[in-house]
Every structure is written in C-alpha cells, then in structure tokens.
Interface confidence: low
Amino acid sequence: GWVWNQFFVPEEMNTTSHHIGQLRSDLDNGNNSFQYKLLGAGAGSTFIIDERTGDIYAIQKLDREERSLYILRAQVIDIATGRAVEPESEFVIKVSDINDNEPKFLDEPYEAIVPEMSPEGTLVIQVTASDADDPSSGNNARLLYSLLQGQPYFSVEPTTGVIRISSKMDRELQDEYWVIIQAKDMIGQPGALSGTTSVLIKLSDVNDNKPIFKESLYRLTVSESAPTGTSIGTIMAYDNDIGENAEMDYSIEEDDSQTFDIITNHETQEGIVILKKKVDFEHQNHYGIRAKVKNHHVPEQLMKYHTEASTTFIKIQVEDVDEPPLFLLPYYVFEVFEETPQGSFVGVVSATDPDNRKSPIRYSITRSKVFNINDNGTITTSNSLDREISAWYNLSITATEKYNIEQISSIPLYVQVLNINDHAPEFSQYYETYVCENAGSGQVIQTISAVDRDESIEEHHFYFNLSVEDTNNSSFTIIDNQDNTAVILTNRTGFNLQEEPVFYISILIADNGIPSLTSTNTLTIHVCDCGDSGSTQTCQYQELVLSMGFKTE
C-alpha cells in the first residue's frame, strides 16, 4: 500500500524548490524498479515529483490566501511490466499560513455621530478589521485594536474595536474629530502587521448654550405716524448651538409690553420690534423697553444651562410728524331756532395743532349757504332757517393749519333747527257737506279735523269754535271733541233750499302753542231736498250730490 505523511508547504517561500515530503509504495525495495507519477491541478507546474524516489517538491512561491490546498493524484508503475503497482490514490497538500497579511478595515469610510457632552463610556461606533491570514494558525489573524489619534477624547476596546468616549467634548469648541485606529495582528506581538483606519466622529449638538444678545443696548426709531403692526427694527441674539437648539423666542418683559411687542422671525432668528399701540411724539417722545430671549426647545435635563434669560435694553425714539389739526370732539351737534335772524350764533367748534409749533387754525364749512364760520370756529347763520323746510343740516367742518395748508382735518357737524310756533292749525282737508231741508235740530252733519305744520313738544291740541258772527247768528253749532276733532250740528229745525241753498260757516281753529295761533277755515254746507225717507232728491249744487254718490231722480 501507499505510505505518506500529511503534506504541508509554507506559503511565500522564496526558494526555487522546496521539499514537501515523500510518496512511496511499501512494495518499493529501493532498487529503482518503480516509477512515481503526479497528476492533477498544479502537477508539473507548481509541484514536481522525483520519479524514482517519490519525493515531492514545490517549485513556485505559494499564496495560502489565494489557494490553501491542492488535491493531487499519485501513481506508481512497475518499470519492467508497465503495470500499476498500487491503485491510483488522491492526496492533499496544505499550504500553511505565515503572517503576510495586515489587517484591513473593509467598511471604510467610518463616520459616526455622537451628542456633545456625552459621558465617558458612551459607545460611538465599532470598527472591524479583517485579516486574510489563517485564523486557526497561531495568532496570525488575531487582532488587537489601538488608538493612534484621538486621545484624550476617545478610547478603543482592544479586542472588539468598540470606540467609546473617554472625555467630554464640547461641539462649540470643536465639532468633529478624526480618530485613527490601528489594528495589529499577532495580538500585538513582535512581527505583527498593522492596518489603520480613520473614523470621522461628528458631534451632534445639544442645547447647552443659551442665546445671548449681541448688544446690551439697541437704539430704534419710530415715526409717530406709523400704524400699529409696523416693524420698527430688529434685535439679534446669538446662540453657539445649531439647528433646533439655536431657535429662539424674543419677548418683552411684562411691565414694558403696552406699546411695543417683539415677534420672532424663525427663519433668521431675529427679534422684530413691532408697534402695538400708536405713539404720539407730543405725548411721549421716547420709550425704554427691556427684551429677553430664550431658546424655543430646552429639554428638562438641560435647563441648568438656561437658568437666566439674556436681556437687552431697547431705546425707542419717536420721530415727530406734522400732524393735521385735532378737533376737541369727534363731531359737533348744535341747535338753533328757526326764523332766527341772519348772523345768529349757532355754536363754536375748536381744533388745535397737536404738534409742538401750534400753528393757528382756519375753519371752513363745506358746501353750505346757510351757515358761516369764522377763524375762531364760531358758527353763525347766513340765512333765515325754516324748520318746516329742513329740520336738520348734516355738514362737514374743515380745519386747516395756517402754516401748512396740506394739514387738514374734517369732522361732521349736525345742526338741528328747533321749532317755533309759526304755523296755525288748519283743516286737514277741504270740507263740503249738505243738510236736508227737513233736518231736525242737533243733527250731526260733518266731523272735522285739523293739522299743524309745527312740531309740538307735547302733543298738538286744537281748539275749535265758530267765528263770532256765526256764533251769534248761526243755523249751525260746533262741539269740540277734545281729541283734535269737532262735529258740526244743526242748530234749528228745517231749511229752505229756495231761500238759502248754501251756508258758509267760518270755523276758528287754535293751537296750544305759545303764543297760540288761530286760523279761520270755511265749511261749505249745501241744502238739499231729501224726500220723506231721507234720501237725497235735489240739491242746487248737483255736482256735489253726484260726487257724494247720492241718488238723483
């Protein structure tokens, strides 16, 4: 049978031939009667065999990392007969490892992010090197990690490659670190090979800085004409943190927040000072407010960095603007009696220049032929007034500064024309009626009412009477109903159409005004032949009968 030991050849041997071992048959008595042959991949090129002895040699340098074993076949032949002495056999040549590969970091580039101010021992990242040498061959692939660059802030666990923080770091001093890790094989013993990798460690921000104002005093100006909501300037704090941790909110300390406000522009992180209430140079020409700034997001555990908010003082100067005249009242209402003579006093309006120079004021009334106004603001009538034509006047008064005629103010003026009793009451309509020839005494023939164009402070009250002539010699009488109406009654029995076809009665109507006014009104009464049944037959004034709807034969 075949006799051999296990075959090993060290990799990277520089010799041109290296004896590996011997293949032999136990039938071989050493008299060179057998021939040995080598077959398979590498036979003749990488490995050769001494045909007589069976000694195997490697004639090329081998690389275990390229190929770690070779499977070959051996034959032994009897030279005399040409027959195989032993059956063909397969055998293995193993390439033994030497430490010819340095550790390599395959996952480069390494980059890690860790919060600033992280405590010692915080895990940052794990780096892993691989070594192509044989892990089962001694310590050739057993690695030890060490830190070449990165002390005193970082450390590396020698066997795992885990990088940890060994000293607190402040992102605001330095925001990234290059750590260089070395991996050595042979667990660092002499003859070890090494590989290095760089790890970029970036510090992420934590909110460990409060915002601080750039200036302790800001000077701003605002025009007194500025409307509320006007931005009058910006203030700025800076925060060494970044991103969300540098977002800030500006505010005004409570006592100072009546006239101004501060809103935060979250894009620029500026504080915009806003006018909250209109200012008046003549009332107050400067303001002082205290503003404070705080971070928008502060986790509870970082509140120790934010105990006292940064403050700044803002001095705001109010700029004077030439303002239009200011009336004492927003509108004026005056009363004047009708029928007062031209030039009568109506009232006085007053406007002043709110500015410090106190320009004299000129007044005018727009589109009015009825009233005048002088430079003192005194309003008088320029025509007689009749309440019954116009009881109210809606006018506009304009005040203009003498030194700057562009500065104008206008306000409404309402003038009420008060009533005087200048109209007597009169019939509310034209009255024309009839009486039958056969009418009896005390018969009601007409109810009358009156109207008065005057305005009554109380209710109108009218008094009805017959004129003196009619009272003394009248076929009719009148009764005042005490409700601004009266009734006309016959004062006799029977009337004669032929003798007296029509009566004209003068009725006096007086009002309750002071002084009282009285008018005389005529009531026309026609005499008609009414027949026995009382239906109208004939009146001399035929049209009346028709218009009243009475039947005619």
């Epitope: 830190l147 070449l148 660059q149 990165g150 002390q151 005193p152 802030y153 001093l173 330095q174 290059w178 260089i180 090494s194 290095t196 760089s198």
Partner: antibody
Amino acid sequence: QVQLVQSGAEVKKPGASVKVSCKASRYTFTSYYMSWVRQAPGQGLEWMGIIHPSGGDTTYAQKFQGRVTMTGDTSTSTVYMELSSLRSEDTAVYYCARGGIKLWLHFDYWGQGTLVTVSS
Amino acid sequence: QSVLTQPPSASGTPGQRVTISCSGSRSNIGSNFVNWYQQLPGTAPKLLIYTNNQRPSGVPDRFSGSKSGTSASLAISGLQSEDEADYYCAVWDDSLNGWVFGGGTKLTVL
C-alpha cells in the same frame, strides 16, 4: 486662527543652555500635543521631541536624550524647550509645531521660529 | 543621512506637472501615514498634505499625495511660480519611536 508665538533670537556660548518659549492661543491648549523641530542653516528639518501640555508626557528623539527638556505651563498656555550643553552644531532655527504623536499625526500649525546661535 | 530619501532638487516650467518622491521602509512609510510640508523661503514650514493624501483647507487641489508600500510621492500639477519652495515628507517611525523627515527637495520653477 490658531497662533503660536515664539520667544526672540538667542546667542549662546558653547556649553551653555538655552530655553525657548512658545505661547499658544486661540485653541484649547491642553488638548493638543506640541512638537519641537529644528532646522540648521541650509539644512533640512529635524524632529527633537514632543510634549503633551496637560500631563507633561514627553517623548524625545534619541539624538537629544539627556540634553533636551520640554515643559508646559497651562496657566499661560506656553510650552518651553530647554537644550543644554550647547555646541556650535546646535546653531539652528527652532520651531514649535502643534501635533505629532498619538493625538494628531501631522503638524498643523507652526510657530514663527527662534534663531539660536551658538558661538564662542 | 535622512531615514527618508528625497531627491535634493526638482524643477519644472509653469503649467507643468512635477512629482517629488519619498522613499522609506516598513517601519515608517510602510506602517504609518505620510505628511508633506512646504517651506517658502524665510518662513516656517506649512502643512501641505496629511495622512497620505488629505489636503488642509486652503491648499489648492493642484497638490496631491499618494502612498504605495514603503514609498510616497507628492504631485504638483499646473505648476506656478509661487510653488517655488522646499518640500519635506515626514512620517512616524515605529522603530525609532519618533518623527523622521526627508532631506527636503528644492523645487525651482523655471
């Protein structure tokens, strides 16, 4: 910008000692190593040694062992290099340079240099 | 005699590309990062390339570094007159436990 400002030029007799200072500013002094490098007239650069200012750890080039002493003063952010037993061949411009072993594998900032002349 | 070997001089015309070599051993260049320094006449050296091929901010991208085995090189493309200076390679040597510099290369722009 980091600044390293060195002391002024010195003239010394052979056998004497010289102490050169290097004041650092605009960075955290205790976080960085400081090396000393010299350059003889018309010659190349020669590394002398390194110090970590916070702990005072030093590593000296074999050539200068026993003759050079490097110290640091954290209160003034200053490092010092003292070279004793001066010889004429020590005539050179001496530079402090931030960086070196372990912490930074390069010298990123240099002082302006101090000329030391050794002459009898 | 420097541990790192550099050519004493190099030259080129404006716009040209020049390369400066730096040869060492396994204990220095073979194991560690290479740095390059530029020293303009009468001034302190200035860091030009660090960790083999990184440029500090402010150094033009005309300057590039590379390392292979136990050698390193500095390449300058688009040569300019202001590049005329001494160039030094430097590396930590594990055997000597210290920094070693090349002898320096004087670059002349013709």
